[in-house]
């Protein structure tokens, strides 16, 4: 075993991964308190599935239970054989009830596809249990599944392109061994953050993979490079999204959760950020006129840094319900920004920004601001990221975001902040006077910013207000307005035009 | 109609084992989960845990861990609470009541109640 | 464990007029626009009966005089006007995802 052993914190549990297999266990040694796995002096439990038929949007109607073999349940509760039906199926489970997202997904597919089945599957007693073993149990789920839509595919008019499995965590690996073991192939598996530990890098037939379906979407909202990764790294599906990254979701932070909890944990902020996937998802149903869009890009950081906001050759596309079927790409990884609430969609705008002069930058990176004024509304100010470093004589390129629709651009304002905000950069600062002290104050030339706006696929070229006046130092600010050649449209279509 | 009847009072020795049961009718019994509420006189409600009415899985709230124990006889769609070597603080009214497993897990219906008394 | 406490722990309100009961949680007890909130009316030798649910539901069968509102951790049930049948102790209950449910210490509600 190795010397140094990471304990990586999962909800209020730990686990202690050494050479790459998991042990579990938990504080004060009340593991098993913690996750019932069941005692002699428990009633044993029935290693069983239920399918309920969710046959009401009111959350406390009981619904139909299907079973596989019984037809009068379906004539019963009008199973509508020629209908989509979706398959809801939970993850694992600490406290063994359907937690609260369970219900705003139903009612959302209800709310968005009417004559729709929507059946639940309930798995509780087999995810009720300690997280290893939960996995163990995917695989029985996954056939309980197949047999189900197996028996339903023996019906006249049912089909199983009609069919869109749905899992969130260890759900979305059990949509995956359900789509492998079934005759035929399901239309769609959507995958809400898959579960991370003992599914990353497992072979393709031991997790959720594009092979499952004819068309697998992924949405990823808890992955760490460092630490436990709550939800899988790797794309495993035709498309994968990446939300913020995939990491850190807007609203999730422990500022956030803590301001409405008085004494809330690294708990909180876990599931927020897990289930921030299904919101997502629930988003796109509900908010139809209002889709997100994520944009292929190799990694996160090429994508902060702005330069994948293309929609040429499909790489660009809604997120959720509304996604295009990609059977084409396997493991596309795509990226977007949100807002902190539904609706989630936010407009990405490129910006290019050539500097073609530079003096007295010193050790510190300059902190820029822009605010973006349109025929719709303005923006707040916001922050240019820095992702690698300003380069000089060079064309940089930034990504921004607003929440509102500004409409057509009319104006940027470029603003270099001035006081330096942290005690380091001052030091920094300070040490770059003391090594140049009879350099005149830092500046930058810039005389053009292009702008291309992610969800219209438009660029723009802004020149300066005074063409004489192109330099900007700390404490300053540069306006910008379009430039006399206005609009230019590229070849490039709009995402807006593909929404299904 | 819904209802839930739960088994008459009983007087209890200090440690002796106690099993009161919670009959349901009116739905079916299976598709809806148990709970079991602890009353001591003059006081408040105190919720002792639940109770999945399909798997048979029992779940304690911490204070209920160990000599507390819930069953289920399906077939007559009846829960049951067991107590274990019973004590003066045990003395209490317990109800049952039913959530919804897709809800929001409030308990729409009760049983009457089932008066526990230590005598001495 | 969700703490609730509610407050008064008895009031005396005179026929007709409003009853105002509040439950505090110490920490929110929201998701995702739903305060998972309930409140239960218990008589002298009588189990709970569900009022409200979801902080702002009304069972059905109770009557409209009884409403709940609030959010995230503050949470009022108001009567109004308040009859004679009222006369009883008011628990509110969390149920949110995790377990435990708690339940308030109670308010006993006399008529004047």
């Known amino acids: 075993m190795s010397n140094s052993v990471p304990l990586l914190c999962f909800w209020s549990l730990c686990y202690c991964f050494a050479a790459g297999s998991p042990v579990p266990f938990g504080p004060e040694g009340r593991l098993e308190d913690k996750l019932h796995k069941p005692k002699a002096t428990q009633t044993e439990v029935k290693p069983s599935v239920r399918f309920n038929l969710r046959t009401s949007k009111d959350p406390e109607h009981e619904g139909c239970y299907l079973s596989v073999g019984h037809s009068q349940p379906l004539e019963d509760c009008s199973f509508n054989m020629t209908a989509k039906t979706f398959f809801i199926i939970h993850g694992w489970t600490m406290s063994g009830i359907f937690e609260n997202w369970l219900h705003k997904l139903v009612s959302a597919l209800h709310t968005r596809e009417k004559d729709a089945n929507v059946v639940v599957v309930d798995w509780l007693p087999l995810a009720h249990q300690l997280y290893t073993d939960a996995v163990n149990n995917t695989r029985v789920v996954g056939h309980s599944i197949a047999r189900m839509l197996d028996w339903l595919q023996e019906k006249d008019d049912f089909s199983l392109g009609n069919v869109h499995l749905i899992g969130y965590s260890l759900g979305a690996h059990v949509a995956g061994y359900a789509g492998n073991f079934v005759k035929g192939t399901v239309g769609r598996i959507t995958g809400l953050d898959p579960a991370g530990p003992m599914f990353e890098g497992a072979d393709i037939h031991k997790r959720l993979s594009p092979d499952d379906a004819d068309f697998v979407d992924v949405l990823h909202t808890y992955t760490r490079s460092f630490g436990l990764s709550i939800g899988i790294q790797m794309p495993v599906g035709h498309i994968d999204i990446y939300p913020n990254g995939g990491d850190f979701q807007p609203g999730c932070g422990l500022n956030d959760v803590l301001g409405s909890i008085a004494y809330g944990t690294i708990t909180e902020v876990v599931k927020c950020e897990h289930e921030r996937a299904v919101h997502l998802f629930v988003d796109s149903l509900v908010n139809q006129d209002k889709p997100s869009f994520a944009f292929q890009c190799t990694d996160s950081n090429r994508f902060k840094k702005g330069i994948c906001l293309s929609c040429r050759k499909n790489r660009c596309n809604s997120i959720g319900y509304n996604a295009k079927k990609m059977r084409n790409k396997r493991n596309s990884k795509m990226y977007l920004k949100t807002r902190a609430g539904m609706p989630f969609r936010v407009y990405h705008y490129q910006m290019k920004i050539h500097v073609f002069s530079y003096k007295n930058m010193g050790e510190i990176e300059p902190t820029f601001y822009v605010t973006l004024y349109g025929t719709n509304a303005d923006s707040q100010t916001l922050p240019l990221e820095i992702v690698e470093r300003i380069e000089q004589n060079a064309t940089n390129t930034f990504l921004v975001y607003t929440e509102e629709d500004l409409g057509d651009l009319l104006k940027i304002q470029l603003t270099w902040e001035g006081a330096s905000q942290s005690w380091y950069n001052l030091w920094k600062e300070f040490r770059s006077y003391l090594s140049q002290p009879r350099n005149p104050g830092r500046e930058l030339n810039i005389r053009r910013i292009r702008v291309k706006s992610g969800e219209t696929q438009r660029k723009l070229t802004f020149c300066t207000e005074d063409p004489e006046n192109t330099s900007i130092s700390p404490g300053r600010e540069l306006w910008f307005r379009k430039c006399r050649d206005g609009w230019r449209m590229k070849n490039e279509t709009s995402p807006t035009v593909e929404l299904p | 109609q819904i209802q839930l009847v739960q088994s008459g009072p009983e007087l209890k020795k200090p440690g002796e084992t106690v099993k009161i049961s919670c009959k349901a009718s009116g739905y079916t019994f299976t598709n809806y989960g148990m709970n079991w509420v602890k009353q001591a006189p003059g006081k408040g409600l105190k919720w002792m845990g639940w109770?999945?009415?399909?798997?048979?899985?029992?779940t304690y709230a911490d204070d209920f861990k160990g000599r507390f124990a819930f069953s289920l006889e399906t077939s007559a769609s009846t829960a049951y609470l067991q107590i274990n070597n019973f004590k003066n603080e045990d003395t209490a009214t317990y109800f049952c009541?039913?959530?919804?497993?897709?809800?929001?897990?409030?308990?729409?219906?009760w049983g009457q109640g089932t008066a526990l008394t230590a005598s001495s | 464990d969700i703490v609730l406490t509610q407050s008064p722990a008895s009031l005396a309100v005179s026929l007709g007029q409003r009853a105002t009961i509040s439950c505090k949680a110490s920490q929110s007890v929201d998701y995702d626009g739903d305060s998972y909130m309930n409140w239960y009316q218990q008589k002298p030798g009588q189990p709970p009966k569900l009022l409200i649910y979801a902080a702002s539901n009304l069972k059905s069968g109770i009557p409209a005089r009884f409403s709940g509102s609030g959010s995230g951790t503050d949470f009022t049930l108001n009567i109004h006007p308040v009859e004679e049948e009222d006369a009883a102790t008011y628990y509110c209950?969390?149920?949110?995802?995790?377990?435990?449910?708690?339940f308030g210490g109670g308010t006993k509600l006399e008529i004047k």
């Open positions: 209950q969390q149920t949110t995802d995790d377990p435990p449910w708690t």
């Open positions: 109770i999945n009415t399909y798997s048979g899985v029992p």
């Open positions: 009541a039913r959530f919804s497993y897709y809800g929001r897990h409030y308990f729409d219906y």
